[in-house]
Interface confidence: medium
């Protein structure tokens, strides 16, 4: 299902745009996986960590069959904007422990911003509405401790990894339907 009748596509080949988005998503997934592994080496995680402010995972094995391109792109963009905010917060609030990951966190943020720009371009080419997040943006509070910021980093990187993993699968599946 494409845009409503009467709304012209700017791009001649949305599949090529989608390919480009998939490549960027895959690249970011690899970076995130590498940084998450680096985090586990430097700061071993004692179990799974969660953060209430992170978005809930949008896709699962059960929902893959019913995916629609507008919904996937909109939700992915909203979720990635949330992760971008969390990465920016980590870089500012993390303290000296996380400063040792600064080059990698900075690169991750830059690639996340690039992917978001690509998704925005793709949505405009497909004449999809640039939906704003449903909920108001809640400011992220300071970590309770340095240890707390490390736990938050584990949660953010773990959540981003899962989100990107499902995004790659979802986008590839949607490409076959275009």
């Amino acid at each position: 299902p494409g845009p409503p009748a009467g709304s012209p596509r700017v791009s001649s080949d949305p599949r090529a745009d989608l390919d480009s988005a998939v490549l960027l998503t895959r690249s970011l997934l690899a970076d995130t996986r590498q940084l998450a592994a680096q985090m586990r080496d430097k700061f071993p995680a004692d179990g799974d960590h969660s953060l209430d402010s992170l978005p809930t995972l949008a896709m699962s094995a059960g929902t893959l069959g019913s995916l629609q391109l507008p919904g996937v792109l909109t939700r992915l963009r909203v979720d990635l904007m949330s992760y971008l905010r969390h990465v920016q917060w980590l870089r500012r609030a993390g303290g000296p422990s996380l400063k040792t990951l600064e080059p990698e966190l900075g690169a991750l943020q830059a690639r996340l911003e690039r992917l978001l720009r690509r998704l925005q371009l793709l949505m405009s080419r497909l004449a999809l509405p640039q939906a704003a997040p449903d909920q108001p943006v809640i400011p992220l509070g300071p970590p309770a401790s340095a240890w707390g910021s490390i736990r938050a980093a584990h949660a953010i990187l773990g959540g981003l990894h899962l989100t990107l993993d499902w995004a790659v699968r979802g986008l590839l599946l949607l490409k076959t339907r275009l």
Partner: antibody
């Protein structure tokens, strides 16, 4: 309540060494990064060093790099500052401070180090 | 010379509003949170503002912080005699890999 108590200050000759301690209580010491900040008589605050909560990451001000070493013993809830090759310009009140991330939320009362011949 | 620049002194009469500025660069204020500390005569510094504009519990709402680009400011409204103290801004500096302070501003309540 959170308490930070510095000790080990005193008068020392240039070139000699001194070790400062900071005893922490009232919080889970091993969860917090810790800093040393100093203040020369009549002057402003100067950051000295920081150590991460588990002790593996350390950063120092250029003015003390290679001479001062920050360390901690989480089992004793104590922060240390080993000061070697002391100079007259190291004369200051030394404060230890706790940080949850990017700010110092609790400070000790300070200990005075005087480097003089 | 301090990495962050503050005016050495500021003054005001009781009830007045005073503002203290703090100027830095992209590697400190521009990319990290700004914190403000109050040091009353003969005492250790105390956290006044953190995360650019947040107040710890116990700090009166007469104190407020703000940031724009590579500059920050501390505003004190309804000035009181007990506000007479030294005020310091601070931030992490990514280039120096450490915390940098302003030179401090001595506030006098006339």
């Amino acid at each position: 309540q959170v308490q930070l108590l510095e000790s080990g200050g005193g008068v020392v000759q240039p070139g000699r060494s001194l070790r400062l301690s900071c005893a922490a209580s009232g919080f889970t010491f091993s969860h917090y990064d810790m800093h040393w900040v100093r203040q020369a008589p009549g002057k402003g605050l100067e950051w000295v060093a920081v150590i991460s909560y588990e002790g593996s990451n350390k950063f120092y001000a250029d003015s003390v790099k290679g001479r001062f070493t920050i360390s901690r013993d989480n089992s004793k809830n104590t922060l240390y500052l080993q000061m070697n090759s002391l100079r007259a310009e190291d004369t200051a009140v030394y404060y230890c401070a706790r940080t949850p991330g990017s700010h110092f939320d609790y400070w000790g009362q300070g200990t005075l180090v005087t480097v003089s011949s | 010379q301090s990495v962050l620049t503050q005016p050495p002194s500021a003054s005001g009469t009781p009830g007045q509003r005073v503002t203290i500025s703090c100027s830095g660069s992209s590697s400190n204020i521009g990319s990290n949170y700004v914190n403000w500390y109050q040091q009353l005569p003969g005492t250790a510094p105390k956290l006044l503002i953190y995360y650019d504009d947040l107040r710890p519990s116990g700090v009166p709402d007469r104190f407020s912080g703000s940031k724009s680009g590579t500059s920050a400011s501390l505003a004190i409204s309804g000035l009181r005699s007990e506000d007479e103290a030294d005020y310091y801004c601070a931030a992490w500096d990514d280039s120096l890999s450490g915390v940098v302070f302003g030179g401090g501003t001595k506030l006098t309540v006339l």
